[in-house]
């Protein structure tokens, strides 16, 4: 899916409302310098992008994100606010429905969401130079 | 089973404004938003805005901006539509309709539909 | 905004015969289009969704088809409860829009 045409100020205050609240939640009791962020963006559709990868496809160590507050909060913004990811997400949604994995907070999930803490504070400065 | 039930009739004078609400029930209310349609008499529907209650915000149609406010009451599982400094071609039915916001995507349930009609 | 625009606006048939409506939008939209019916006094409900997707509970008689800026609903024989007033919607992008409808009467 290409991000290109989303409504990024409307992401960016739903994210500043409830998202990163719902991201810190999950984080609570892990010190801000546990985890080094290796995933990086460039701009906001690249930094949507790389959200969407970590929030939604199950990885090595993490395969339940998807059923996290902060995770079902992203994909009705993105479905809202992006035109056309809503159809992209009908066959993912019923294939997730089968899938349906076990909420059990990892040591990989934690370090996964401290990135994606990481991407969403990149995506809210779009115009500082990447280091 | 899923039930969107609106409130009664209304009369407003022009510059007047009503507030039209919407019970939801059979149905987790945060996951969906809510989406108010109007139908002026013999006419077309017109989508006016959402709520969106997961995400705590709104978003309207520019056609109605400054006019129209849309909230939810996730304690009662209830909808509400504002629409203030009321002409006569407000005239309409208002209509409340679902719309799954993480899965299905559509307006999938629709209230009965409140007429309410501007007149001096 | 998306424009969708209906054709034709009314469509008179008899009972057993076939209905087809067409819905062209103002922009590529993908699959993003849902149809409705809806009979006077009532509620619009829900027929197709993302252009071919059944519905439940709706007889197999109605169908959807297209992609990109054309759509079709068929009502492949009418029967005499389905004499209504028929909307295209767009779910595409934001303000949703709907076409202006298009009535299929008994001739």
């Known amino acids: 899916y290409d991000f290109t045409n989303c409504d990024f100020e409307k992401i960016k205050a739903a994210y500043l409302s409830t998202i990163s609240k719902d991201l810190i939640t999950y984080m609570s009791g892990t010190k801000s310098t546990e985890f080094n962020n290796t995933v990086s963006c460039s701009n906001r559709p690249h930094c949507l992008t790389e959200i969407q990868s970590l929030t939604f496809n199950p990885t090595a160590g993490c395969a339940s994100l998807a059923k996290e507050m902060f995770a079902m909060k992203t994909k009705a913004a993105l479905a809202i606010w992006c035109p056309g990811y809503s159809e992209t997400q009908i066959n993912a949604t019923q294939a997730m429905k089968k899938r349906r994995a076990a909420k059990v907070t990892t040591n990989k999930c934690l370090e996964q969401v401290s990135q994606l803490q990481g991407l969403w504070r990149r995506f809210n400065r779009p115009l500082l130079k990447q280091q | 089973q899923v039930q969107l039930v609106q409130s009664g009739a209304e009369v407003k004078k022009p510059g007047a404004s009503v507030k039209v609400s919407c019970k939801a029930s059979g149905y987790i209310f945060t996951d969906y938003a809510m989406h108010w349609v109007r139908q002026a008499p013999g006419q077309g529907l017109e989508w006016m805005g959402t709520f969106i209650p997961l995400l705590d915000t709104s978003d309207y149609n520019q056609n109605f901006k400054g006019r129209v406010t849309m909230t939810t009451d996730t304690s009662t599982s209830t909808a509400y539509m504002e629409l203030r400094s009321l002409r006569s071609d407000d005239t309409a039915v208002y209509y409340c309709?679902?719309?799954?916001?993480?899965?299905?995507?559509?307006?999938?349930?629709w209230g009965q539909g409140t007429l309410v009609t501007v007149s001096s | 905004e998306i424009v969708l625009t209906q054709s034709p606006g009314t469509l008179s048939l008899s009972p057993g015969e076939r209905a087809t409506l067409s819905c062209r939008a103002s922009?590529?939209?993908?699959?993003?289009v849902h149809w409705y019916q809806q009979k006077p006094g009532q509620a619009p409900r829900l027929l197709i969704y993302f252009a071919s997707q059944s519905i439940s509970g709706i007889p197999d008689r109605f169908s959807g088809s297209g992609s990109g800026t054309d759509f079709t609903l068929t009502i492949s024989r009418l029967e005499p409860e389905d004499f209504a007033v028929y909307y295209c919607q767009q779910t595409f992008s934001l303000p949703y829009t709907f076409g202006q409808g298009t009535k299929v009467e008994i001739k």
């Open positions: 922009q590529p939209i993908s699959i993003s």
């Open positions: 309709a679902r719309m799954g916001v993480t899965h299905s995507y559509v307006m999938d349930a």
